[in-house]
């Protein structure tokens, strides 16, 4: 299993939207991809979950564009705020 986030950093103005890319490799038949936000304290905050057999997930300002064939799961954060400045991680799980 492998997860790759190629964007090391990205900058966008407040109120707009940003898309964070994540590619993965897995041999699992059924799985989930999770997106987390890491606070300065290093605490990880869960944002949204995408199931391998589910339609694109959406929760408020967070939405996922899931392309199973391409093994891509991009997170879009819209209505950006200064408080969104942080490190974002995607994770793969069964």
């Amino acid at each position: 299993q492998k997860v790759t986030q190629a964007q090391s950093s990205v900058s966008m103005p407040v109120r707009k939207a940003v898309t964070l890319n994540c590619l993965y490799e897995t041999s699992w038949w059924s799985y989930y991809i999770f997106w987390y936000k890491q606070l300065p304290s290093k605490e990880m905050i869960f944002l949204i979950r995408q199931g391998s057999d589910e339609q694109n997930a959406k929760s408020g300002r967070y939405s996922v564009n899931f392309k199973k064939a391409a093994k891509s799961v991009a997170l879009t954060i819209s209505a950006l705020q200064l408080e969104d400045s942080a490190k974002y991680f995607c994770a793969l799980g069964e």
């Epitope: 109120r15 939207a17 819209s78 705020q81 200064l82 408080e83």
Partner: antibody, heavy 118, light 111 residues
Framework: EVQLVESGGGLVKPGGSLKLSCAAS????????MHWVRQAPEKGLEWVAY????????YYADTVKGRFTISRDNAKNTLFLQMTSLRSEDTAMYYC???????????WGQGTTLTVSS | DIVLTQSPASLAVSLGQRATISCKAS??????????MNWYQQKPGQPPKLLIY???NLESGIPARFSGSGSGTDFTLNIHPVEEEDAATYYC?????????FGGGTKLEIK
Amino acid sequence: EVQLVESGGGLVKPGGSLKLSCAASGFTFSDYGMHWVRQAPEKGLEWVAYISSGSRTIYYADTVKGRFTISRDNAKNTLFLQMTSLRSEDTAMYYCAREGAYSSFDYWGQGTTLTVSS
Amino acid sequence: DIVLTQSPASLAVSLGQRATISCKASQSVDYDGDSYMNWYQQKPGQPPKLLIYAASNLESGIPARFSGSGSGTDFTLNIHPVEEEDAATYYCQQSNEDPWTFGGGTKLEIK
């Protein structure tokens, strides 16, 4: 289930003050920007004020700038609107709304009524 | 400020037919490929309800008979087929820049 419940409205004399509250539940309040929007009787919608999740960014409509103050208490999941120097034209239903995708207002409270009259 | 002009101010549509509401912005509400235009429905005595965000995205739980289109300065809300429960006032709203602004509203009557 997302819920927003406004309170604090009432009848105030011109020049008076009032503080509105909006109690939020069913979502991570500290992760969302919040707005106040008002609607005068038989009129359209007018945006009033915005506060970001951690209160770092605040905007006001020109019509209320210097008179209204938006604030929030993330520990208590509550949004506030302090209104001073009230005028008859501030008479309206006041709604709090959550800022959703693409800065839309995806959830609204039922509103609280402010009447400014002598 | 971005001024939003809705037309018509009111319209009457027969049950099952199409209702089309236009919203024109005084300047573009697009940014980086996204259109920051949203549509709301408001029934008497109720708060507004989000129908469409970012010009064409249907909000969760909203029937597929509602659709939005447009970019730049010209946007359209379509309802087809219209149902009795769609009688309401509809507002467009731009969120591209401060201050957030609303159109004047369009009152839909079902014949």
